[in-house]
């Protein structure tokens, strides 16, 4: 089926949200964000095989397209879907602020 | 310089608008589709080193644990950013009907 | 249920000081960031302050910045809202709120109402 | 600071109308617009958040849209008890700041 959640190469191997443990050091942050001192960052990792969780017409294609021209076609991609936003508390010329931001974590993953 | 169009490992080798000649056969339309028989299929291909078209915060975090952990985290990827419609003549139960498809082609590409 | 109760009303001289109280229940009081939020009579929202839920980072409004200062005790689970050399356009109605990381108000309390007035 | 306007200031409205009020916020706000309704002698109590998203046990008559500086709160068809005050306010940045209110009034 089109859009499919059951992963052919096995659990949990195929396109999904994953959490990683991050400190404001390792996302490059130390230098403008007081808090939170950690993230935990939520991305889209994994395969995406024909058919799973594929984001549109475009998706399609571009699996098809793959499958003949694998040297020329890379296969889709997962990237978020949509994303969670995030307050941080960050440094500014004046001070300190809060300050909202959308695309930071990843809600919910497909194919393109 | 963040969100650079400048790519760092040559020209034509970072995230791009490419162009990829197709038949109807090729895109796995035959069946449904009457046309056109042969489609210029843009798609966004190539590499996302650091800071090039980065799309939003995700994918800066994405590059900087990607740095830090290569193998759990995965390069931002290449996917468009918008799209350009396209008109399909297409079979239906009833005969032939004419259908826009809005995520079909790639219009401009950034990395995610 | 969570529950916010303000406390501390009163009729004030310009120039005076006065210290609200809040009384939260019925959720992990230390988990979250609170903010103050007043109504003028002319009935205009205004924010007045923001504590994180470890209270380690303070916000005010430029107009009470310098005058105001907000705190929190975690283990009465209390807010407090500290207001000295008040002015007449200090007179509101003082709300406590909860904020559940976004910067929106799901919960408000009944609010206490400061006078400011010779 | 964002300066949120909002309009009309008092809305005219008969029980059934399908009535709309806008909030412009003076700069991008992504879609970080929140919608409160205050009934008198009430608390504000939250509608909507991130522009569009409808709070826990709203009626789904109340919507909002809207993205960047331009948002609209719409009441599908008008009850009785919704006459109250509405108010936007922007969670993107502090100073968090809100809009001057919208008076839901009967004709």
């Known amino acids: 089926a089109r859009n499919g959640d059951r992963c052919p190469l096995g659990p949990g191997r195929c396109c999904r949200l994953h959490t990683v443990h991050a400190s404001l050091e390792d996302l490059g942050w130390a230098d403008w964000v007081l808090s939170p001192r950690e993230v935990q960052v939520t991305m889209c990792i994994g395969a995406c095989p024909s058919q799973f969780r594929e984001a549109n017409m475009h998706a399609q294609i571009k699996m098809n397209l793959h499958r003949l021209k694998p040297d020329t076609v890379p296969a889709p991609c997962c990237v978020p879907a949509s994303y969670n936003p995030m307050v941080l508390i960050q440094k500014t010329d004046t001070g300190v602020s809060l300050q909202t931001y959308d695309d930071l974590l990843a809600k919910d993953c497909h194919c393109v | 310089a963040r969100n650079g169009d400048r790519c760092p490992l040559g020209p034509g080798r970072c995230c791009r608008l490419h162009t990829v000649h197709a038949s109807l056969e090729d895109l796995g339309w035959a069946d449904w589709v009457l046309s056109p028989r042969e489609v210029q299929v843009t798609m966004c291909i190539g590499a996302c080193p650091s800071q090039f078209r980065e799309a939003n915060m995700h994918a800066q975090i994405k590059m900087n644990l990607h740095r830090l952990k290569p193998d759990t985290v995965p390069a931002p990827c290449c996917v468009p950013a918008s799209y350009n419609p396209m008109v399909l003549i297409q079979k239906t139960d009833t005969g032939v009907s004419l259908q826009t498809y809005d995520d079909l082609l790639a219009k401009d590409c950034h990395c995610v | 249920d969570v529950k916010l109760v303000e406390s501390g009303e009163g009729l004030v001289k310009p120039g005076g000081s006065l210290k609200l109280s809040c009384a939260a229940s019925g959720f992990t009081f230390s988990s979250f960031a609170m903010s103050w939020v007043r109504q003028t009579p002319e009935k205009r929202l205004e924010w007045v302050a923001y504590i994180t839920s470890g209270g380690d980072y303070i916000f005010y409004a430029d107009t009470v910045k310098g005058r105001f200062t907000i705190s929190r005790d975690n283990a009465r689970n209390t807010l407090y809202l500290q207001m000295s050399s008040l002015k007449s356009e200090d007179t509101a109605m003082y709300y406590c709120t909860r904020d559940d990381g976004y910067l929106w108000f799901a919960y408000w309390g009944q609010g206490t109402l400061v006078t400011v007035s010779a | 600071s964002i300066v949120m306007t909002q309009t009309p200031k008092f809305l005219p409205v008969s029980a059934g109308d399908r009535v709309t009020m806008t909030c412009k916020a003076s700069q991008n706000v992504g879609n970080n617009v929140a919608w409160y309704q205050q009934k008198p002698g009430q608390s504000p109590k939250l509608l909507i958040y991130?522009?569009?998203n409808r709070y826990t046990g709203v009626p789904d008559r109340f919507t909002g849209s809207g993205s960047g500086t331009d948002f609209t709160f719409t009441i599908s068809s008008v009850q009785v008890e919704d006459l109250a005050v509405y108010f936007c306010q922007q969670h993107y940045s502090s100073p968090l700041t809100f809009g001057a209110g919208t008076k839901l009034e009967l004709k």
């Open positions: 991130y522009a569009s």
